[in-house]
């Protein structure tokens, strides 16, 4: 069904990292435009990205209102210059996206090592608590604020002179590891949500090594 020169959107894909959430689709429009609608399971449809020629729509503002909700989205196709025109069933063509649960589905962004500090044979490694676009009481929440103890970090560390990696885990954003005196170490961290079945892990952070800017050394 549908008007002769309007095609339904397809390959609808949610792209979401640390709750920054964009719905993408195909095809690139030829003589047509798109409008996106989003709703919660129990809510009303809200239109976004009105009559756009883009093939993506930023829905972050909607999903951050409640990241534990389930969201539905759909993309409507209209003939360019005649947005009142409808399909043969009396409605414009539309395609549904798969349901989206931000808390479960958003990918974990690449973490950053904020600092490391050596005191004797101990090194304290701190992971930056990245800010998200989720708001509460007029402030932006951090990743830890949103995920709480569902979020853990894994630290990979190794002597600069060798390739044998050790690991440590933490329920906070801090590690305190034992190191050999006089040795330089390199560090990388990964964010993990163990309770998830997909999108459990982030990519590894950039590697930081002792003897470089970020570190601090105290006897």
């Amino acid at each position: 069904s549908g008007t002769t020169n309007t095609v339904a959107a397809y390959n609808l894909t949610w792209k979401s990292t640390n709750f920054k959430t964009i719905l993408e689709w195909e095809p690139k429009p030829v003589n047509q435009v798109y409008t996106v609608q989003i709703s919660t399971k129990s809510g009303d449809w809200k239109s976004k990205c009105f009559y756009t020629t883009d093939t993506e729509c930023d829905l972050t503002d909607e999903i951050v209102k409640d990241v534990k909700q389930t969201y539905l989205a759909r993309v409507f196709s209209y003939p360019a210059g005649n947005v009142e025109s409808t399909g043969s069933a009396g409605e414009p063509l539309f395609t549904n996206a798969r349901k989206f649960l931000p808390y479960r589905d958003t990918k974990l962004g690449q973490p950053t090592i904020q600092s490391f500090e050596q005191v004797g044979t101990k090194v304290n490694v701190t992971v930056e608590d990245e800010r998200t676009l989720v708001r509460r009481n007029n402030t932006f929440l951090s990743l830890r604020d949103v995920f709480g103890k569902d979020l853990i970090y894994t630290l990979y560390y190794w002597k600069s002179s060798s390739s044998g990696k050790k690991t440590a885990k933490t329920n906070t954003n801090e590690f305190l590891i034992d190191v050999d005196k006089g040795e330089n170490y390199c560090f990388s961290v990964q964010a993990v949500i163990p309770s998830r079945t997909v999108n459990r892990k982030s990519t590894d952070s950039p590697v930081e090594c002792m003897g470089q800017e970020k570190g601090e050394f105290r006897e």
Partner: antibody, heavy 125, light 108 residues
Framework: QVQLQESGPGLVKPSQTLSLTCTVS?????????WSWIRQHPGKGLEWIGE???????RYNPSLKSRVTISVDTSKNQFSLKLSSVTAADTAVYYC??????????????????WGKGTTVTVSS | EIVLTQSPGTLSLSPGERATLSCRAS???????LAWYQQKPGQAPRLLIY???SRATGIPDRFSGSGSGTDFTLTISRLEPEDFAVYYC?????????FGGGTKVEIK
């Protein structure tokens, strides 16, 4: 030294909502700890109900999730428990507790190291 | 949910004796997430051991924890009169956090 004190009605009628508040003194509720509710049925073991972070992030026991709401009021240094549609099976001593990070094996993990004295709640008509 | 089974249910011992309490998990628990608590009548539980083997602040060294995977043990090397109580193991790695059914250590 942080202390916790539970407060709320000791008697709740069946089908009503049980409401308890835990007041934190001697420290800030926003200081990076989590705050839990646990209950103990008469003569029985302990059951974890749920927890909250100062940001409002919560985790609940799935067996109670449909009836439980835990909230936090940072301005009053309090967190609260609401348990709806109560029955006699919800009669218990209710404890609030603080979850604090302890160092272990290179990282930090949370344990319930400070508890309130507990408050007895009876569900009866 | 992870089920923690404690044994024995009751341990009858005399002061000065050694107490060995067992906690078995229905599935593997990381040592990082295993704790032991002591509870006396009319009181709230008190954290004794965290990370399966580390003593909490102010806990005497007669209390020790060990184990990994699915089998954990709390040992009281020499029972003092104030040690007679109920002991619970707890895992905090998987929601719901769960407690064992408890072991009552009573005076023989």
């Amino acid at each position: 030294q942080v202390q916790l004190q539970e407060s709320g009605p000791g008697l709740v009628k069946p089908s009503q909502t049980l409401s308890l508040t835990c007041t934190v003194s001697g420290g800030s509720i926003s200081s990076g700890q989590y705050w839990s509710w646990i209950r103990q049925h008469p003569g029985k073991g302990l059951e974890w109900i749920g927890e909250i972070y100062y940001s409002g992030s919560t985790r609940y026991n799935p067996s109670l999730k449909s009836r439980v709401t835990i909230s936090v009021d940072t301005s009053k240094n309090q967190f609260s428990l609401k348990l709806s549609s109560v029955t006699a099976a919800d009669t218990a001593v209710y404890y609030c507790a603080r979850d604090t990070p302890y160092y272990y094996d290179g990282g930090y993990y949370y344990y319930m190291d400070v508890w309130g004295k507990g408050t007895t709640v009876t569900v009866s008509s | 949910e992870i089920v923690l089974t404690q044994s024995p249910g009751t341990l009858s011992l005399s002061p000065g004796e050694r107490a060995t309490l067992s906690c078995r998990a229905s599935q593997s628990v990381s040592s990082s997430y295993l704790a032991w608590y002591q509870q006396k009548p009319g009181q709230a539980p008190r954290l004794l051991i965290y990370g399966a083997s580390s003593r909490a602040t102010g806990i005497p060294d007669r209390f020790s924890g060990s184990g990994s995977g699915t089998d954990f043990t709390l040992t009281i090397s020499r029972l003092e009169p104030e040690d007679f109580a109920v002991y619970y193991c707890q895992q905090v790695g998987v929601v719901p956090y769960t407690f064992g059914g408890g072991t009552k250590v009573e005076i023989k």
